[in-house]
């Protein structure tokens, strides 16, 4: 953390003061920003924001929905933010199926985990058939699975996101791949 | 280019515990996944276990789970397997691996295409 020297302003408290924070299905999400020019909580995930004017942001009962980015911004623009995961063990996916790729540039399939402790994230293709022996990808739990330099053979391809849980692979709803020529 | 250097094989009686090391240099900041394999005599490289250096999620065999942890220390740039209730078949030199992105098969040995020179692992009985 860089330090502030006094007359500068500074960027708001978060409590807990933790960059990831992993609550369960049912519990409640109890978050307070200490700031005095505090403005407002941003919440996001996928292409949902919420916002909230209240210095606490409280959730009663957490549901796998409520996982993502919480930010809290203060008077002079400046911002804190802590990420959420609600483990839930029936929706271990947040989706948005849509996904297209411009061919030998990066895409993401958008399948955040709501678990960031499951296992071997990963792309299988549907129905048992194989992916493509040359698909590479970098996974991020809070946003996705990039697949990395697409190609235009991969277009109409239908792939799930998989983690594997208590020993059982789970998938999430299909995805289909939509590429555009480079050209 | 990357360079991988493997520590902290030996020898260790069966149910005991070993923690390998593997420190990179080199272009690190571009090579996302991190791997470890293991060849026995006489047979083919096996996956072990693998970590994305960026979101931290890990991947094992299910026959791996449970005993064997991977883990990695950004600052150091270092992966670590975690051993545990080791058996004589886990007898094996380990390899560190590491490129810039997971294979879709990220258990294929293969597509791989940065390799440490390995450590020796042998557990007596």
């Known amino acids: 953390q860089p330090s502030v020297s006094p007359g500068e302003p500074s960027p708001p408290s978060i409590h807990p003061g933790k960059s990831d924070l992993i609550v369960r299905v049912g519990d409640e999400i109890r978050l307070l920003c200490t700031d005095p020019g505090f403005v407002k909580w941003t919440f996001e995930i996928l292409d949902e924001t919420n916002e909230n004017k209240q210095n606490e942001w409280i959730t009663e009962k957490a549901e796998a929905t409520n996982t993502g980015k919480y930010t809290c911004t203060n008077k002079h623009g400046l911002s804190n933010s802590i990420y959420v995961f609600v483990r839930d063990p029936a929706k271990l996916f947040l989706v948005d199926r849509s996904l297209y790729g411009k061919e030998d540039n990066d895409t993401l399939v958008r399948c955040p985990l709501t678990d960031p402790e499951v296992t071997n994230y990963s792309l299988k293709g549907c129905q048992g058939k194989p992916l493509p022996k040359d698909l590479r990808f970098i996974p991020d739990p809070k946003a996705g699975i990039m697949i990395k330099s697409v190609k235009r053979a991969y277009h109409r391809l239908c792939l799930h996101c998989s983690v594997d849980q208590e020993g059982k692979s789970v998938l999430s709803e299909k995805f289909i791949l939509k590429v555009r020529p480079a050209f | 280019e990357v360079q991988l250097v493997e520590s902290g094989g030996g020898l260790v009686r069966a149910g005991g515990s070993l923690r390998l090391s593997c420190a990179a240099s080199?272009?690190?900041?571009?090579?996302?996944?991190r791997a470890w394999f293991r060849q026995a005599p006489g047979k083919e490289r096996e996956f072990v276990a693998a970590?994305?250096?960026?979101?931290?999620?890990?991947y094992y065999p299910n026959s791996m789970k449970g005993r064997f942890t991977i883990s990695r220390d950004n600052a150091k740039n270092t992966v670590y397997l975690q051993m545990n209730s080791l058996k004589p078949e886990d007898t094996a030199v380990y390899y560190c691996?590491?490129?810039?992105?997971?294979?879709?098969?990220?258990?294929?040995?293969?597509?791989?295409?940065?390799w440490g020179q390995g450590t020796l692992v042998t557990v007596s009985s």
């Open positions: 691996a590491a490129d810039e992105s997971f294979p879709a098969y990220y258990s294929d040995y293969a597509l791989y295409r940065y």
């Open positions: 080199g272009r690190t900041f571009t090579y996302d996944a």
């Open positions: 970590i994305s250096w960026s979101g931290g999620s890990t």
